[in-house]
Interface confidence: low
């Protein structure tokens, strides 16, 4: 797994996502580069080392690491996009609503994609929790529908206009990530000028019977305190030329990365620029909702 072997192999071999990001730095060891960047940054802060702040550490979502692993090991699975953004569910207070075998999960995303970019693909990633009796071998069969909650045009706030984005089925035997394509919706959102968008996930029994202990349960993990928070992954292309990309990349590396260290947790560098440091730095590029991945 590339994530597990960051120190063992050169950046160029592992980072298929960043195929030409560091091409102008051939022969430069990334650890050395990172160390010198850290030293420069510390110098400007008049510090000799980075203070430990365990509580500030932010782990990238599990799926983003899986995504990195997937693209790093299989280049063909990478969509033809040069930017990847992830957006976390920001509805931290709503609870799932349950009745007659139907469960509704409200989700909220703040999505901002510059107008000059072309959205290649967008995926809603949901972590499905399969809860069943261990003695029951069968999986859990469910219908799933992703709705977009549209702004109400009428006076009655109780009336909500819901648009079906994706419908499908899940046959779950294990808790795992499920992917739903929401490209059309994200393209609309990009044009709309509004950044806050509400989705609702409906899960219902496939055979119209109410859920019971014998058939097991399938739920969406919406808890914000873990790595399984619903994610919106947007793959886009900024249409700029390779030359512009490289110039922008160099600028991003020299200017954008270091000021964002506080978002990552400065303690990630305290043990030296090892595996964790690289992971944190890379996860910043891959995960921060405004950060960009370049190919």
């Amino acid at each position: 797994s590339p994530i597990m072997n960051l120190e063992q192999s050169p950046l160029e071999e592992d980072m298929s996502l960043f195929g030409d990001v560091f091409s102008e730095q051939d022969g430069v060891d990334f650890n050395t580069l990172l160390q010198s960047m850290k030293d420069e940054f510390l110098k400007t802060l008049n510090l000799s080392d980075i203070p430990t702040q365990d509580s500030a550490k932010v782990d990238p979502p599990e799926y983003m690491l899986e995504l990195y692993n997937k693209f790093a090991t299989d280049r063909t699975s990478m969509p033809s996009a040069n930017i990847i953004r992830s957006f976390k569910n920001e509805d931290l207070f709503s609870q799932p609503v349950s009745f007659n075998g139907l469960r509704k999960y409200p989700l909220l995303f703040n999505v901002s994609i510059p107008h000059h970019e072309e959205v290649i693909m967008a995926e809603l990633r949901l972590y499905t929790l399969v809860q069943r009796d261990r003695m029951i071998y069968d999986g859990v069969d469910r219908k799933i529908t992703i709705f977009e909650v549209l702004e109400s045009k009428g006076d009655n706030e109780g009336e909500r206009n819901m648009l079906v984005l994706v419908s499908g089925e899940i046959y779950g035997t294990n808790s795992e990530w499920e992917t739903f394509d929401v490209t059309d919706a994200i393209r609309r959102w990009q044009k709309s000028g509004s950044s806050t968008h509400q989705l609702e996930v409906h899960i219902e029994s496939k055979h119209d019977e109410a859920e019971d202990a014998s058939s097991g349960r399938l739920e969406i993990d919406t808890s914000a305190q873990n790595k399984h928070n619903p994610l919106l992954i947007v793959f886009s292309d900024d249409q700029s030329s390779d030359k512009e990309r490289k110039e922008e990349l160099n600028e991003m590396i020299s200017h954008e990365q270091l000021p964002e260290l506080d978002n990552l947790g400065l303690d990630s560098f305290s043990s030296g620029p090892g595996e964790e440091a690289l992971l944190q730095m890379r996860s910043n590029i891959i995960y921060d909702s405004t950060a960009r991945i370049r190919r």
């Epitope: 063909t76 699975s77 969509p79 033809s80 290649i120 693909m121 219908k143 529908t145 079906v164 994706v166 419908s167 499908g168 089925e169 046959y171 739903f180 394509d181 490209t183 059309d184």
Partner: antibody, heavy 116, light 112 residues
Framework: SLEESGGRLVTPGTALTVTCTVS????????MSWVRQAPGEGLEWIGS?????ITWYASWAKGRFTISKTSTTVDLRISSPTTEDTATYFC??????????????WGQGTPVTVSS | DIVMTQTPASVEAAVGGTVTINCQAS??????LAWYQQKPGQPPKLLIY???KLESGVPSRFKGSGSGTQFTLTINDLECDDAATYYC??????????????FGGGTEVVVK
């Protein structure tokens, strides 16, 4: 645009590959499908391939048909044709919706005749 | 398997009249349904997607409605050029969904 080719007269059991050549379409971003139509009959979906090279097929077509692609072509291989496979084979670009789609662009089709 | 059933198999109407074509899914497919028009010797042409959304360039005389399992294509102010065979197609589900054929059997529209 989409252009099918490779349709011809074959004898039963002789493998055949029909090809869809695309222009102006990035196959790494699109869902591509094969649909056939027997003479005087309706449309019959065979299978699809998406931008991640994932393929899926109609329940009746599994094992008999194989879809693959390059950067500019999408191939449909019929492993062991029977007379029932005589049809016009259409290549179509799908507007992707959760591993499926509706078809906004079609080729003109290529006729395949299976006869002894 | 999801099965799409289209009725009637054939319908005849006069110029200026109205034609209604029905499509029934063997299970709920939400609004994930498209309608196509096909003329002899030509490939199908997309008319409607999302059960009711008109494809760009298609006259507003074509109207799609319905959701779940029952869908309807209505052609108003019938013109000679509308003589064709019309097909419905579902695109419900994903990799795991099994289709015998996501297309309906077709409805031939004859314009008098």
């Amino acid at each position: 645009s989409l252009e099918e080719s490779g349709g011809r007269l074959v004898t039963p059991g002789t493998a055949l590959t029909v090809t869809c050549t695309v222009s102006g379409i990035d196959l790494s971003r699109n869902l591509m499908s094969w649909v056939r139509q027997a003479p005087g009959e309706g449309l019959e979906w065979i299978g699809s391939i998406n931008f991640r090279n994932i393929t899926w097929y109609a329940s009746w077509a599994k094992g008999r048909f194989t879809i693959s692609k390059t950067s500019t072509t999408v191939d449909l291989r019929i492993s062991s044709p029977t007379t029932e496979d005589t049809a016009t084979y259409f290549c179509a670009r799908g507007v992707y919706v959760n591993s499926n789609g509706y078809y906004s662009l079609w080729g003109q089709g290529t006729p395949v005749t299976v006869s002894s | 398997d999801i099965v799409m059933t289209q009725t009637p198999a054939s319908v005849e109407a006069a110029v200026g009249g109205t034609v209604t074509i029905n499509c029934q899914a063997s299970q709920s497919v939400s609004n994930l349904l498209a309608w196509y028009q096909q003329k002899p010797g030509q490939p199908p042409k997309l008319l409607i997607y999302g059960a009711s959304k008109l494809e760009s360039g298609v006259p507003s005389r074509f109207k799609g409605s319905g959701s779940g399992t029952q869908f309807t294509l209505t052609i108003n102010d019938l013109e000679c050029d509308d003589a064709a065979t019309y097909y419905c197609q579902t695109y419900w589900g994903g990799d795991g969904t099994s289709y015998l054929n996501p297309f309906g059997g077709g409805t031939e529209v004859v314009v008098k």
